[in-house]
């Protein structure tokens, strides 16, 4: 389980068509 102070930081992963983009790349979301 993530610590409380981490909860508002994004987690970043590689994906395609994520983060409002059409191609593949890194995407960071809370």
């Amino acid at each position: 389980r993530r610590r409380r102070r981490d909860t508002h930081f994004p987690i970043c992963i590689f994906c395609c068509g994520c983060c409002h983009r059409s191609k593949c790349g890194m995407c960071c979301k809370t």
Epitope: P10, C12, I13, F14, R21, K23, C24, M26, C28
Partner: antibody, heavy 121, light 107 residues
Framework: QVQLVESGGGVVQPGRSLRLSCAAS????????MHWVRQAPGKGLEWVAV????????YYADSVKGRFTISRDNSKNTLYLQMNSLRAEDTAVYYC??????????????WGQGTMVTVSS | SYELTQPPSVSVSPGQTASITCSGD??????ACWYQQKPGQSPILVIY???KRPSGIPERFSGSNSGNTATLTISGTQAMDEADYYC??????????FGGGTKLTVL
């Protein structure tokens, strides 16, 4: 101004350990992912590892996985690379680099000056 | 493992256009970045997300990416542009790939 300064490089024997540091200034360190990238003498760039905002969100190149550990101390604005079981092929200039800001940080937008690591008996 | 292939060297006359290619499997499906590195110096980001220029990078630097090839184009090449250039792309969360680098010579 925005700056990254690496330290901790040197000459080390195969199988030994070394810890590199990267001191960041001029920006809010905790708001950025941070990378280590290396460059063997006369060769190209090779990505080593990244640590994102949460300390547990980190990834490694296959060539260093299980031997190197990336970490950060946001209170000290410092990035680290703990290198264990060093091999001759780890000889390189090691750069720390900042990931782009935002939710799509594909690029490395700020680089340090590098620190040289030589693995030799 | 994935590879990005660049020509080892490209030569151009001052004022002319230089094109540096970066080829890889389905390169056009991922975002390409380009870095400039002069001897004894650290790399500098010149193009990101295929076509975008960071602030401070001259307009003569541009990029494109489709099919299996990303291209860095330098229009009106100047002597100060002589450097090594590296492309870069992500193939997974644990696989950031750099091209082998291209030495640009301004004749």
């Amino acid at each position: 101004q925005v700056q990254l300064v690496e330290s901790g490089g040197g000459v080390v024997q195969p199988g030994r350990s070394l810890r590199l540091s990267c001191a960041a200034s001029g920006f809010t360190f905790s708001n950025y992912g941070m990378h280590w990238v290396r460059q063997a003498p006369g060769k190209g760039l090779e990505w080593v590892a990244v640590i994102w905002y949460v300390g547990s969100n980190k990834y490694y190149a296959d060539s260093v996985k299980g031997r190197f550990t990336i970490s950060r101390d946001n209170s000290k604005n410092t990035l680290y690379l703990q290198m264990n079981s060093l091999r001759a092929e780890d000889t390189a200039v090691y750069y720390c680099a900042r990931a782009q800001e935002g939710m799509a940080p594909d690029a490395f937008d700020i680089w340090g000056q590098g620190t040289m690591v030589t693995v030799s008996s | 493992s994935y590879e990005l292939t660049q020509p080892p060297s490209v030569s151009v006359s001052p004022g002319q256009t230089a094109s540096i290619t970066c080829s890889g499997d389905k390169m056009g499906e991922r975002y390409a970045c380009w870095y400039q590195q002069k001897p004894g110096q650290s790399p500098i980001l010149v193009i990101y997300q295929d076509t975008k220029r960071p602030s401070g990078i001259p307009e003569r630097f541009s990029g494109s990416n489709s099919g299996n090839t990303a291209t860095l184009t330098i229009s009106g090449t100047q002597a100060m542009d002589e450097a090594d250039y590296y492309c870069q792309a992500w193939y997974s969360s644990t696989n950031v790939v750099f091209g082998g680098g291209t030495k640009l010579t301004v004749l």
